[in-house]
């Protein structure tokens, strides 16, 4: 039976999750290393391609699932990139921080793909200037 709703990860959800898992963290996934990727070749798919290889790390499972959904529904954002830096590995937390910085930067500078992204960007800008994350 189909769901009465068709949820998709929104950019504000992705940004909030990336903030959540990197805040006050020196490392993620026990310092696991992943391939560095060119985020400009399609940030969702490129980041997913690298992070999908990390297993047994519950901290990034939600991020992986969001990226998977975003990558599959946004072909305009670029498919899996062949431009991987196979000679460069970085820590998971560094890749996640790079992704967070890149997502914020793209939308701060107005590189939108439609009205929904403009709306999301406005929320992201608010988020950046007023964000106070709560921990248990």
């Amino acid at each position: 039976s189909p769901s009465p709703v068709t949820p998709s990860p929104t950019l504000k959800e992705l940004i909030e999750e990336l903030v959540n898992i990197t805040q006050n963290q020196a490392s993620l996934c026990n310092g696991s290393m992943v391939w560095s990727v060119n985020l400009t070749a399609g940030m969702y798919c490129a980041a997913l391609e690298s992070l999908i290889n990390v297993s047994d790390c519950s901290a990034i499972q939600r991020t992986q699932r969001m990226l998977k959904a975003l990558c599959s529904q946004k072909p305009a954002a670029g498919q899996i990139s062949s431009e991987r830096s196979r000679d460069t590995k970085i820590e998971v937390i560094q890749l996640v921080k790079n992704l967070l910085t890149y997502v914020r930067g793209v939308y701060r500078h107005g590189n939108f793909r439609g009205l929904n992204d403009i709306f999301e960007a406005q929320k992201i800008e608010w988020h950046e200037h007023h964000h106070h994350h709560h921990h248990h």
């Epitope: 039976s1 949820p7 959800e13 499972q61 959904a69 608010w126």
Partner: antibody
């Protein structure tokens, strides 16, 4: 038609244990994250626990952490909530609910609930 | 932990507009979902991702989200809309619900 049917609710003394079950039908159970939400008599909704589709990740509300365990058997299309060291303030109707997102966000279908009463 | 604040009750005359607020710290950065619950029944999702209506939910229900406040609006409230309404967000690795608002429709 999506259906979620809870069972296992009962009256129990403080410190006791109960195991709730939720049998799902009308959808591919193994593809959905699931959760438990409770509602004390005359009170509001309170999320209790959730579990990823494959059971690889779980999370709990602070009020039940260390006492309750959520699990699932995808072969039986069944969600469970093991409740140990029950307290009077755990008295509530317990609802089983489905999350249509793969990452965890909201609930689109709910069961009718099963009543748990903890009293001495 | 993240807290969502709702008024305990809202009263509206029949066929008038009812507005139910849901306050939270920078709630604008979150996706807000709304549920309707009638006495003795399970909750029903009526708005998701701030302003989207699930199939089967009447057009009179709408949602918005800005600043520190999300709002559920019921335009032309009917007697059948009398119920408890809950807002919900995802925060701190879990589902957070508001305290609930009892809507009374007069007339």
């Amino acid at each position: 038609e999506v259906q979620l049917v809870e069972s296992g609710g009962d009256s129990v003394r403080p410190g006791g244990s109960l195991r709730l079950s939720c049998v799902a039908s009308g959808f591919t159970f193994s593809r959905y994250n699931m959760g438990w939400v409770r509602q004390a008599p005359g009170k509001g909704l309170q999320w209790v626990a959730w579990i990823y589709d494959g059971g690889s990740r779980t999370s709990y509300a602070d009020a039940v952490k260390g006492r309750f365990t959520i699990s699932r058997d995808n072969a039986k299309d069944t969600l469970y909530l093991q409740m140990d060291d029950l307290r009077v303030d755990d008295t509530a109707v317990y609802y089983c609910a489905r999350d249509p997102s793969s990452w965890g966000s909201l609930f689109d279908y709910w069961g009718q609930g099963t009543l748990v009463t903890v009293s001495s | 932990s993240y807290v969502l604040t709702q008024p305990p009750s809202v009263t509206v005359p029949l066929r008038q507009t009812a507005r139910i607020s849901c306050g939270g710290d920078n709630i604008r950065s979150k996706n807000v979902h709304w549920y309707q619950q009638k006495p003795g029944q399970a909750p029903v999702l009526i708005i998701y991702n701030d302003s989207n209506r699930p199939t089967g939910i009447p057009e009179r229900f709408s949602g918005s989200n800005s600043g520190n406040m999300a709002t559920l609006t019921i335009r032309g409230a009917l007697a059948e809309d009398e119920a408890d309404y809950y807002c919900q967000v995802w925060a701190n690795d879990g589902y957070v619900f508001g305290s609930g608002t009892q809507l009374t429709v007069l007339g």
